[in-house]
Interface confidence: low
């Protein structure tokens, strides 16, 4: 329904607080280097303008699109050319090209300082002194570091962030109350950002059809009692929400997400029996809860799939009449029967089914041709099952840190051209699959593990896309969204790689390592491990283990020494020499 003023419409729907927060997120996600104060000034100007439009929708410029209004505002930033270089050229374009140009310049790995957490008392003082600025700063810092963060979900995180400070800053022991909550928000936030990044990559790189297929499979697993028509409606609405958020249309996205939550709760009887608790919550909590809700129980009397999709004489007729609807029905029926499969596996099965029908419906005897299509699914199902079994056994044997190291070695050998920080970050996250998923029973392991790996490998893909260095990574990332993990799994050692020149500086350590947290110390050691493999890609597990054990002993010894720096200098030289000898460098 057309509104005379889009900005007035969204302001009224969302309310001033959410409107301002979402505009701040949008601006920070576009201009990631701009100072906080500059963004706040821009947001206040937009908000004041929106209020004039609420008062009189016919007022000057109130009829302009949100992209035009926001883009014009962003293009008033004085230092655009100095700070952002060629992004300033976007301002010479007209909408919608200008917005597309801004989107293309979003940086998944912006050159921003690490967020350092101040002392609890300092944070509590800042919170009490100016709560509004404190919370805006949280939105700004997260949004600029995560330019695809799901904006309405970030409002939910901000609400929890505020609640944590409200509760803990008046607690007897502020730190004991606050720090675990902040750690939890940080970890959940990183996971939420990565999950949303995959949704946006899916839409932007593989198109709406790919996203809709993912949504059909996931919603059918979650709501197996819902009719196909109901699932299709939810998929259409969900696709609109995510298309908007991934496209920078955050006000529309948040508004439509609220409408979708309202619809789901009003129709929960025909969707799922698990929604009752979610639907009693306030809006932000409700939307989050629905997104995370557990799978409903499968209907007891589901018939065999073969009747409609293999045995029926009408398979090719039904397929020809409405290909995507028929394939959607297949995916829905398969997914609702298989909460134990990963979404990507279900999509591989649907793709195999589609390929078979394309071939067979043009054959002399179609039925004879596709009669055995379900037999083709067996190896596709067994491959992730076996992989997860092997890796969970390895994880249980090694523990998380050493399991991460095994993956670091594995992936560095596969794609040694990738930057060391990216290999460390991605392999550490791949390794977390163990603690996240291996504890689950068999029926929950695959959806947990393989769908999580899809999220992590997407991080590799988006980081690599910024500075492509490996044809193998590009190939696995771009050929097929659902086959990314099997593609990376299938990569062997890159025999074409020319080992990196040995540089002693890379393996020089100082006393500052002793004061690092356990996590940061692990990252230092894992960085050294990646560099070792890049120097000696043919090194055996045993050789690498020996060098890493020596390295751990060296760090422990020098951190206990009275003169740490001298110890690191002298013992470090010996360690480098010994390692070179051990690895034949």
């Amino acid at each position: 329904d057309a509104h005379k003023s889009e900005v007035a419409h969204r302001f009224k729907d969302l309310g001033e607080e959410n409107f301002k927060a979402l505009v701040l997120i949008a601006f920070a996600q576009y201009l990631q280097q701009c100072p906080f104060e500059d963004h706040v000034k821009l947001v206040n100007e937009v908000t004041e303008f929106a209020k004039t439009c609420v008062a009189d929708e016919s007022a000057e410029n109130c009829d302009k699109s949100l992209h035009t209004l926001f883009g014009d505002k962003l293009c008033t930033v004085a230092t655009l050319r100095e700070t952002y270089g060629e992004m300033a050229d976007c301002c010479a374009k007209q909408e919608p090209e200008r917005n597309e140009c801004f989107l293309q310049h979003k940086d998944d790995n912006p050159n921003l300082p690490r967020l350092v957490r101040p002392e609890v008392d300092v944070m509590c003082t800042a919170f009490h002194d100016n709560e509004e600025t404190f919370l805006k700063k949280y939105l700004y810092e997260i949004a600029r570091r995560h330019p695809y963060f799901y904006a309405p979900e970030l409002l939910f995180f901000a609400k929890r962030y505020k609640a944590a400070f409200t509760e803990c800053c008046q607690a007897a022991d502020k730190a004991a109350c606050l720090l675990p909550k902040l750690d939890e928000l940080r970890d959940e936030g990183k996971a939420s950002s990565a999950k949303q990044r995959l949704k946006c990559a899916s839409l932007q790189k593989f198109g709406e059809r790919a996203f809709k297929a993912w949504a059909v499979a996931r919603l059918s697993q979650r709501f197996p009692k819902a009719e196909f028509a109901e699932v299709s409606k939810l998929v259409t609405d969900l696709t609109k929400v995510h298309t908007e958020c991934c496209h920078g249309d955050l006000l529309e996205c948040a508004d439509d997400r609220a409408d979708l939550a309202k619809y789901i709760c009003e129709n929960q009887d025909s969707i799922s029996s698990k929604l009752k608790e979610c639907c009693e919550k306030p809006l932000l909590e409700k939307s989050h809860c629905i997104a995370e809700v557990e799978n409903d129980e499968m209907p007891a009397d589901l018939p065999s799939l073969a009747a409609d999709f293999v045995e029926s004489k009408d398979v090719c007729k039904n397929y020809a009449e409405a290909k995507d609807v028929f394939l959607g029905m297949f995916l829905y029926e398969y997914a609702r029967r298989h909460p134990d499969y990963s979404v990507v596996l279900l999509l591989r099965l649907a793709k195999t089914y589609e390929t078979t029908l394309e071939k067979c419906c043009a054959a002399a005897d179609p039925h004879e041709c596709y009669a055995k299509v379900f037999d083709e699914f067996k190896p596709l199902v067994e491959e992730p099952q076996n992989l997860i079994k092997q890796n969970c056994e390895l994880f249980e044997q090694l523990g998380e840190y050493k399991f991460q190291n095994a993956l670091l070695v594995r992936y560095t050998k596969k794609v040694p051209q990738v930057s060391t920080p990216t290999l460390v970050e991605v392999s550490r996250n791949l390794g977390k699959v163990g603690s996240k998923c291996c504890k689950h029973p068999e029926a929950k392991r695959m959806p947990c593990a393989e769908d999580y790996l899809s999220v992590v490998l997407n991080q590799l893909c988006v980081l690599h896309e910024k500075t492509p260095v490996s044809d193998r990574v590009t190939k696995c990332c771009t050929e097929s969204l659902v086959n990314r993990r099997p593609c990376f799994s299938a990569l062997e050692v890159d025999e074409t790689y020319v080992p990196k020149e040995f540089n002693a500086e890379t393996f020089t350590f100082h006393a500052d390592i002793c004061t690092l947290s356990e996590k940061e110390r692990q990252i230092k050691k894992q960085t050294a491990l990646v560099e070792l493999v890049k120097h000696k890609p043919k090194a055996t597990k045993e050789q690498l283990k020996a060098v890493m054990d020596d390295f751990a002993a060296f760090v422990e010894k020098c951190c206990k020494a009275d003169d740490k720096e001298t110890c690191f200098a002298e013992e470090g030289k010996k360690l480098v020499a010994a390692s070179q000898a051990a690895l034949g460098l």
Partner: nanobody
Amino acid sequence: QVQLQESGGGLVQPGGSLTLSCAASGFTFGSFGMSWVRQAPGKGPEWVSAIDSSGADTRYADSVKGRFTISRDNAKKTLYLQMNSLKPEDTAVYYCTIGRSTSRGSQGTQVTVSS
């Protein structure tokens, strides 16, 4: 290298007492507030008590108030927890931490309260 070494745990009957010690090294002990944290089997870490750097300000979780006493000896770089009127629900691994954190930096000492 920062090190915290707890001792003094053991098996004790309900109503009994124990004193836990935490020997610190590798940092300026007298400049930091310290805490005792415990972790019961199958549960997350629970903050028990805290003391400021001078020993003047002490805080306790409601579950141990009036039964436990935290203290410190900066000269000996040692933190203490005197536990009286012990209950079965006090059974846990106890560990000391720098500041008021609930993240484990040490092995801890097992306290079991059982008849």
